[in-house]
Interface confidence: medium
């Protein structure tokens, strides 16, 4: 992790106390005035996650990273890349302990969350808005961030099919058959 420097700031959040490593981690994503379409990442102070945005290719600010990993290492305190996981349970971010939260929208994106009961990352259906930070696009990303152990991976959570969104089977009252696609 980068050494803390004079750039450090404090902020409060309902989600958890948060102390970004650098002031630029608190800057808003800035796409800049140019028209290139460069997939980049920034640290979102509100969700406390590194998220994707499209960078225009010029200007912008320091809260811009070429990879998700680079963003996390730079801006998330205590973030450790754990491709080879420790059996001793390395310290994990507080958001790993948040309950699965599909949000209120109905996009039905497949995402992964860390289930503190089973101590495993499991699949859930995310609605596409709101929700919380215990929400990962890939199983590997979830495991690397939140799982402790030297487990073999695999198991029931890989085939976890539960559609736990409370409103999943109902559909909206007046249009049951529309489908729209999210990436």
């Amino acid at each position: 992790l980068p050494e803390e420097d004079d750039d450090t700031i404090n902020t409060d959040s309902e989600l958890r106390p948060m102390k970004p490593l650098h002031t630029f981690c608190a800057m808003k994503a800035e796409d800049g005035p140019c028209k290139a379409m460069i997939r980049s990442y920034y640290f979102n102070m509100n969700s406390h996650q590194c998220e994707e945005f499209i960078y225009g290719g010029c200007r912008g600010n320091k809260n811009r990273f070429d990879t998700l990993e680079e963003c996390r290492k730079t801006c998330i305190p205590g973030y450790k890349k754990t491709t080879i996981k420790t059996t001793s349970g390395a310290e994990k971010p507080d958001f790993c302990f948040l309950e699965e939260d599909p949000g209120i929208c109905r996009g039905f994106m497949t995402r992964y969350f860390y289930n503190n009961q089973s101590k495993q990352c499991e699949q859930f259906k995310y609605g596409g808005c709101l929700g919380n930070s215990n929400n990962f696009e890939t199983l590997e990303e979830c495991r690397n961030t939140c799982e402790d152990g030297g487990g073999s991976g695999g198991g029931l959570n890989d085939i976890f099919e539960a559609q736990k969104i409370e409103w999943h089977e109902g559909g909206p009252p007046h249009h049951h058959h529309h489908h729209h696609h999210h990436h």
Epitope: Y55, P102, G128, H182
Partner: antibody
Amino acid sequence: EVQLVESGGGLVQPGGSLRLSCAASGFTFSSYAMSWVRQAPGKGLEWVSAISGSGGSTYYADSVKGRFTISRDNSKNTLYLQMNSLRAEDTAVYYCANNGAAAAWDYWGQGTLVTVSS
Amino acid sequence: QSVLTQPPSLSGAPGQRVTISCTGSSSNLGADYDVQWYQQLPGTAPKLLIFGNNNRPSGVPDRFSGSRSGTSASLAITGLQAEDEANYYCQSYDRSLSGSMVFGGGTKLTVLG
């Protein structure tokens, strides 16, 4: 037929409190997330708060966080908004709406006017 | 200052085609979040017109259509009618705010004549 009927609005002094209710009928209330959206006189729409169908997850706009509390009673098919520490800028018509397709609000109530003034 | 930008007003003659634009950024429309459109007739509650970028709820005439591309979206109304005179709002989700459902400032559509 889906119906949402708000009540509880009125005149309140700055710093005061008010509790809005929204009675729902015509759909399976507990299956739907619900939201409050407000509209200041002559202005545009502003999302205020939302709650999941079970009531287990709640969300707030920054402008009301810490002052407003959204809740629901699924046995009564009713949505609530407890508004504390009210300010003049909270003056608006408050609509309740149900979250149906996508990120949309399918159905809206007729609204209830909250006026914060001394 | 609204997160999504709409023209404050537009006008058109009966029978014409009008398009209302809605411009966002990389954290809302550009991040592939759906856009919705609402119609608010004078003195009434908003009504859902388009959801999920281009889907119409039952009962909404096919004169209304929506589209989204990149950081912009638009609502097209063909065969403009007197009863289309209203305020129109676009709405989406913005991930760079603290979980905010966001609206455009609204467009007042006037039907001439």
